[in-house]
Amino acid sequence: TQHGIRLPLRSGLGGAPLGLRLPRETDEEPEEPGRRGSFVEMVDNLRGKSGQGYYVEMTVGSPPQTLNILVDTGSSNFAVGAAPHPFLHRYYQRQLSSTYRDLRKGVYVPYTQGKWEGELGTDLVSIPHGPNVTVRANIAAITESDKFFINGSNWEGILGLAYAEIARPDDSLEPFFDSLVKQTHVPNLFSLQLCGAGFPLNQSEVLASVGGSMIIGGIDHSLYTGSLWYTPIRREWYYEVIIVRVEINGQDLKMDCKEYNYDKSIVDSGTTNLRLPKKVFEAAVKSIKAASSTEKFPDGFWLGEQLVCWQAGTTPWNIFPVISLYLMGEVTNQSFRITILPQQYLRPVEDVATSQDDCYKFAISQSSTGTVMGAVIMEGFYVVFDRARKRIGFAVSACHVHDEFRTAAVEGPFVTLDMEDCGYNIPQTDESTLMT
């Protein structure tokens, strides 16, 4: 997971939309108890912004110690600062908790840049603006870290919501959400609505701003418009999905669809950008450049180095194309597409000497670890992580930033053949999967 700093090929053919629409998700089958409807107490329980992550308030220990915890669908450890650190306002003090149990085991998590290490234990955990339950969960007490905590981010730990396969030190360490589902009646599903600001926020505004919602155990209808469309979770490690086609302003990138998923495609709330494999990134940038050629942007802009600025309120959104990702559908030979606007992939930046202007960073970047659908994508949609049915749902977010001419969209079905061939099979090695 990233914290402004995770053969024989053939094409998946995108076709015209079918005449029929798939049934709306809510019309499908009998409801699971507590599975959907209104979750008022959980709405608006996230804060933060795409550049530094979204966090939820959690309590750990007895008596409860309150901490802000980064919501990360790209990792699987619940890990919290447990020692003083210059970037932490507060940290978990195990010695003050009567319910803490030491597992007498260490954990070390290296990233390409930086690392964290700590000691494993268990304690009682709850989410004040979540389900009214307390669970005993594994906790990695971070005692040492490098380039992990972010100055000014306002979070003190990380909630890895992915599967046990990528948990550290190994898959025997049960992730928080697995513990929650096992120990309570909370359905095995959560959903995220991340709300990008659309304009830069200064530090005091961030602390006061609403970042979105994490609905634990269900789906809240008020957080999306239109229908939810589901894509299968290919494998339960990261939240891995399959992209079958990519379009820029309706123009197919015409790449072998395996390239889009080389070496995987994941949905990761802990990553800021939409990250694309090198070849795909280069093709996408070429296409976005061509579509927006009425203005000449510096090379550094496409790398994320230079910002582009316009006089306040005059950003020419219309010159930038929409980007559509087609995802494998639940029905054979059927896909659907999610479409994001420049309002999602141009990220507003503060701290600039051009304060009379609106300045943006290009938030699509190159990856050597596959496609990462980070906050840039997620801020356009309400995303349902339906673990029980091994699928991820997308609907247009009620809070996404758009203009009067275009809106983010989730549309389907489309006929797409040979979609299984779009998945890349990673050679099995003992190497770490977390070095993103």
């Epitope: 990233q2 914290h3 402004g4 700093i5 550049g51 530094q52 390409t112 840049q113 972010i150 100055n151 000014g152 203005e295 000449k296 942007f297 510096p298 090379d299 550094g300 790398l303 994320g304 180095e305 230079q306 910002l307 582009v308 600025c309 930046v349 701290d351 600039v352 000497a353 051009t354 300045c359 960073k361």
Partner: antibody, heavy 116, light 107 residues
């Protein structure tokens, strides 16, 4: 307030290396790349290269490849430039600068004198 | 590499004058040009970006214009504190390049 702090002077021997620092404050260090610029006495400005602190991706002026190495320490919000195999041609003031559009904030510069 | 040429090394001026410093790019750089002011013994200070936009806090007597290959920095009603060297820079493509500088001097 955005600030880039650089030490004032470095006196070094020919053939050795020097590591210049640039400590950033007043903004989120990983959100902005960091540039390095050379200025020889009484002369113009020469762009050396740039580093992205969030992933250490670098881009160089071909002329400085092999001469300059750019690194960062995000935990201390500090960018570094190491200059190797120093000669009198490397005697100059070296600035770090942060970009938004162009280079909006500059450090005060470190004066490097290469002398035996 | 793109060459940025400031043909006038020195520009004699008096307080109250209006002066124009010119800069020519060897190829089209769009509007991706910045202007900097540097006083003796100091670091450069950013004045103009995107050829014609003033950075925050820069007095409005400084105006930038031009696009493509020809750029101008105009200082209307020159003040004594404006006596300095001025550099143009293109950030359209790597490597970034600077003009050789134009020094404003008292006549």
């Amino acid at each position: 307030e955005v600030q880039l702090q650089q030490p004032g002077t470095e006196l070094v021997r020919p053939g050795t290396s020097v590591k210049l620092s640039c400590k950033a404050s007043g903004y989120t260090f990983t959100n902005f790349w960091m540039h390095w610029v050379k200025q020889r006495p009484g002369q113009g400005l020469e762009w050396i290269g740039v580093i992205n602190p969030s992933d250490t991706y670098t881009k160089f002026n071909q002329k400085f490849r092999g001469k300059a190495t750019l690194t960062v320490d995000t935990s201390s919000s500090t960018a570094y430039m190491q200059l190797s195999s120093l000669t009198s041609e490397d005697s100059a003031v070296y600035f770090c600068a942060r970009p938004t559009v162009g280079l909006d904030y500059w450090g005060q510069g470190t004066s490097v004198t290469v002398s035996s | 590499d793109i060459v940025m040429t400031q043909s006038q090394k020195f520009m004699p001026t008096s307080v109250g004058d209006r002066v124009s410093v010119t800069c020519k790019a060897s190829q089209n750089v769009g509007s991706n040009v910045a202007w900097y002011q540097q006083k003796s013994g100091q670091s450069p200070k950013a004045l103009i970006y995107s050829a014609s936009h003033r950075y925050s806090g820069v007095p409005d007597r400084f105006t930038g214009s031009g696009s493509g290959t020809d750029f101008t920095l105009t200082i209307s009603n020159v003040q004594s504190e404006d006596l300095a060297e001025y550099f143009c820079q293109q950030y359209n493509s790597y490597p970034y390049t600077f003009g050789g500088g134009t020094k404003l001097e008292i006549k």
